[in-house]
């Protein structure tokens, strides 16, 4: 006869491990007992359990409550056992020794491999700002046994670097994603993907990128200078910019206070019926936590009585 077992039994941390040991003998042969022991190299054998054909299962104190026979129906030639709730410390070599009648003793070894699935964590880098050079966007760390694989899934252009660290019963991998921040990256997902044989599917952690920026400011409303004449109603200037975080707007007049009747409504400056008093240099000041920008325009209110139109200057400054 001969013993049938597996070279390697692989289980995920916390699962039950079936340690197979089946005696395939000739007809009439009987199994008297099966002894299971742990036999890691460099250490003496440590008994797990003894399966006796007459007296049943005896589990050694170190494995009390953790070793069982598989559920019935049971074949009398089957010496397999279940190791409940496998932990990392269970990983190693195991041996089953089968005493048969009349063929004698047989032994076989197997290796138990306990997979420890990683619990990845993603740590965002510092605040991203447009104009920075290559900057850490996020780092992702996963530790397990065996070492997990850590990659990135994103449409954003960047560079990655990885380090791995060997620990007592596992290996850790950390990967960093660096990029040159630009406003187009705002709201883009950056996903850390962790693969491991103990996972049914890849684990994914997504970080949404936020890049602070402030666009140049410009002022609309003076495109047709001929509309800016005495008596015109509904004249307005609109300040154009965009930013992250969203900017706030402030209007001032460079050559004095804002004329009475002029209304400030966020990015818009509304005028009452125009008079020559409304001529002047107006400044739109745009700011957010990241930066500030200015744009100034010169308003020249035309008097229809006069023939010659006057120039209108647009100046943008930051």
């Amino acid at each position: 006869g001969e013993l049938e077992t597996s070279d390697v039994v692989t289980v995920v941390l916390g699962q039950d491990a079936k340690l197979p040991c089946f005696y395939r003998g000739d007809s009439g042969e009987q199994v008297g007992q099966v002894a299971w022991a742990r036999v890691d190299a460099g250490e003496g054998a440590q008994e797990l359990a003894l399966l006796h054909s007459k007296y049943g299962l005896h589990v050694s104190p170190a494995y009390e409550g953790r070793v069982e026979q598989p559920p019935p129906p049971r074949n009398p030639l089957d010496g397999s056992v279940l190791l409940r709730n496998a932990v990392q410390a269970d990983e190693g070599e195991y041996e089953c020794r089968v005493s048969t009648f009349p063929a004698g003793s047989f032994q076989a070894r197997l290796r138990l491999r306990v997979l420890v699935p990683p619990l990845p964590s993603l740590n965002p880098g510092p605040a991203l700002e447009e104009g920075q050079g290559l900057t850490l966007a996020a780092s992702c760390t996963a530790e397990g046994s065996p070492a997990p694989s850590v990659t990135w899934d994103t449409e954003v252009k960047g560079t990655t670097s990885s380090r791995s660290f060997k620990h007592s019963r596992s290996a850790a991998v950390t990967s960093e994603f660096h990029l040159v921040p630009s406003r187009s990256m705002n709201g883009q997902p950056l996903t850390c993907v962790v693969s491991h044989p103990g996972l049914l599917q890849d684990q994914r952690i997504t970080h949404i990128l936020h890049v602070s920026f402030l666009a140049e400011a410009s002022v609309r409303g003076l495109e047709d200078q001929n509309l800016w004449h005495i008596g015109r109603e509904g004249a307005m200037l609109k300040c154009l910019s965009e930013g992250q975080p969203p900017p706030s707007y402030n209007w001032t007049r460079l050559d004095g206070p804002l004329p009475s009747g002029v209304r400030v409504d966020g990015d818009t400056l509304g005028f009452p019926p125009l008079t020559t008093e409304h001529s002047g240099i107006y400044v739109c000041h745009v700011s957010n936590e990241f930066s500030s920008r200015d744009s100034q325009v010169t308003v020249d209110v035309l008097d229809p009585q006069e023939d010659s139109g006057k120039q209108v200057d647009l100046v943008s400054a930051s």
């Epitope: 619990l119 964590s121 740590n123 850490l136 992702c140 760390t141 397990g144 620990h167 596992s170 850790a172």
Partner: antibody, heavy 118, light 107 residues
Framework: QVQLVQSGAEAKKPGASVRVSCKTS????????IHWVRQAPGQGLEWMGI????????SYAQKFQDRVTMTRDTSTNTDYMDLSSLRFEDTAVYYC???????????WGQGTMVTVSS | DIQLTQSPSFLSASVGDKVTITCRAS??????LAWYQQKPGKAPKLLIY???TLQGGVPSRFSGSGSGTEFTLTISNLQPADFATYCC?????????FGPGTKVDIK
Amino acid sequence: QVQLVQSGAEAKKPGASVRVSCKTSGYTFTNYYIHWVRQAPGQGLEWMGIINPTLDSTSYAQKFQDRVTMTRDTSTNTDYMDLSSLRFEDTAVYYCARSAGFDAFDIWGQGTMVTVSS
Amino acid sequence: DIQLTQSPSFLSASVGDKVTITCRASQGINSYLAWYQQKPGKAPKLLIYSASTLQGGVPSRFSGSGSGTEFTLTISNLQPADFATYCCQQLNSYPFTFGPGTKVDIK
């Protein structure tokens, strides 16, 4: 706020063992690694080892490999560092510090003075 | 193990000065370097990580640069609170080692 609070000063004889504790609060315990660092009087900082927050796996500096044990108790959010076979040269301030992944140590305990003398 | 050396080991400076401290690694560590400030009887405080990234809440007069084997910590416009010992740390591989430190005191 985030805090790492260490146990009080210890005086030990050569050959004895010491246990230093580090109680963490203000953050999710399992998301950070804990390191132990020591500093002998008038000397620089010396990294002793690291413990994984979720797996109990460790890595120790070679120098301490045979004498140090780092453990944790998730029920109380406390880490422990045991150092055995103490020598005079183990007299130092022992710090615990946390790191997110393998980044720099952003929060440190206040330190525990361990004095070894006969 | 990766060795870190710092220069100078001692530095005298005045308030308002610009101070530069160098840290050299015995082998390449990419940008996996941190800088700490330590005052007597206190735990170290993180200033810079990833060689050049300023830790939140740290004044912008502190800056870091370098990669590979040579790194620099610069304090522009030195303030009274900055008189302390500064040390670097590599996080490229185990064991994570520290530099011996640079003591900055008042001239």
